[in-house]
């Protein structure tokens, strides 16, 4: 999906209003310095591409974040403010349902969510030059 036509200001407002708080809740008990940010993004469409990938694609050591509250809200925000996004996700959702696993918060998942927090922060500051 090409995130170029999303309403970035609305997605930012959704993040600041509620998604950010859910990410903090998920990470509660973890020191902010515990993980290094290794994933970066260069502009808002790129940030949303990375956020979608890290939130919804299973990775080694972290089978699925998709059922977490922050993930459900992220999916909803993209569906609302990215035209045509929902339609592209129908097949992906059906595939995900087939391989759904029980929710387990592993250290790898915590690291992944820490990366997500960094991507969201970058998304909210699009005019900053890349380090």
């Amino acid at each position: 999906y090409d995130f170029t036509n999303c309403d970035f200001e609305k997605i930012k407002a959704a993040y600041l209003s509620t998604i950010s708080k859910d990410l903090i809740t998920y990470m509660s008990g973890t020191k902010s310095t515990e993980f290094n940010n290794t994933v970066s993004c260069s502009n808002r469409p790129h940030c949303l591409t990375e956020i979608q990938s890290l939130t919804f694609n299973p990775t080694a050591g972290c089978a699925s974040l998709a059922k977490e509250m922050f993930a459900m809200k992220t999916k909803a925000a993209l569906a609302i403010w990215c035209p045509g996004y929902s339609e592209t996700q129908i097949n992906a959702t059906q595939a995900m349902k087939k391989r759904r696993k029980r929710k387990v918060t592993t250290n790898k998942c915590l690291e992944q969510v820490s990366q997500l927090q960094g991507l969201w922060r970058r998304f909210n500051r699009p005019l900053l030059k890349q380090q």
Epitope: A13, K75, A77, A79, I80, W81
Partner: nanobody
Framework: EVQLLESGGGLVQPGGSLRLSCAAS????????ITWFRQAPGKEREGVAY????????YYADSVKGRFTISSDNSKNTVYLQMNSLRAEDTAVYYC?????????????????????????WGQGTLVTVSS
Amino acid sequence: EVQLLESGGGLVQPGGSLRLSCAASGFTFGDYAITWFRQAPGKEREGVAYISNFDGMTYYADSVKGRFTISSDNSKNTVYLQMNSLRAEDTAVYYCAAEGRMGTHSRDSVYFWAFSALYDYWGQGTLVTVSS
């Protein structure tokens, strides 16, 4: 030019009723979500009730569930808030606000409808005072 115009506020005794109206113009009413917000003195603006003019889906704040009813008349481009069993704590300025994408995505909007930062258009507000 987009306009939202609230009316129907006033002074009412505890236990009484009022019906607020929000008349809209200047946008495609049937695609939009309209939400009633309220703001009491010294408090943050809070979402009270949401309606999608696209499919009629409604959401309510817990504090008003069972007492307030939101409805829409698409032929008149007007949304109503029927407020029954009013309490002193319902005293506030009531605003209606409109958002263009949450109307056609009402199920996904369950997470976001009550956040004022997401709305494009606002009325000027109408004061509701509940007092004996």
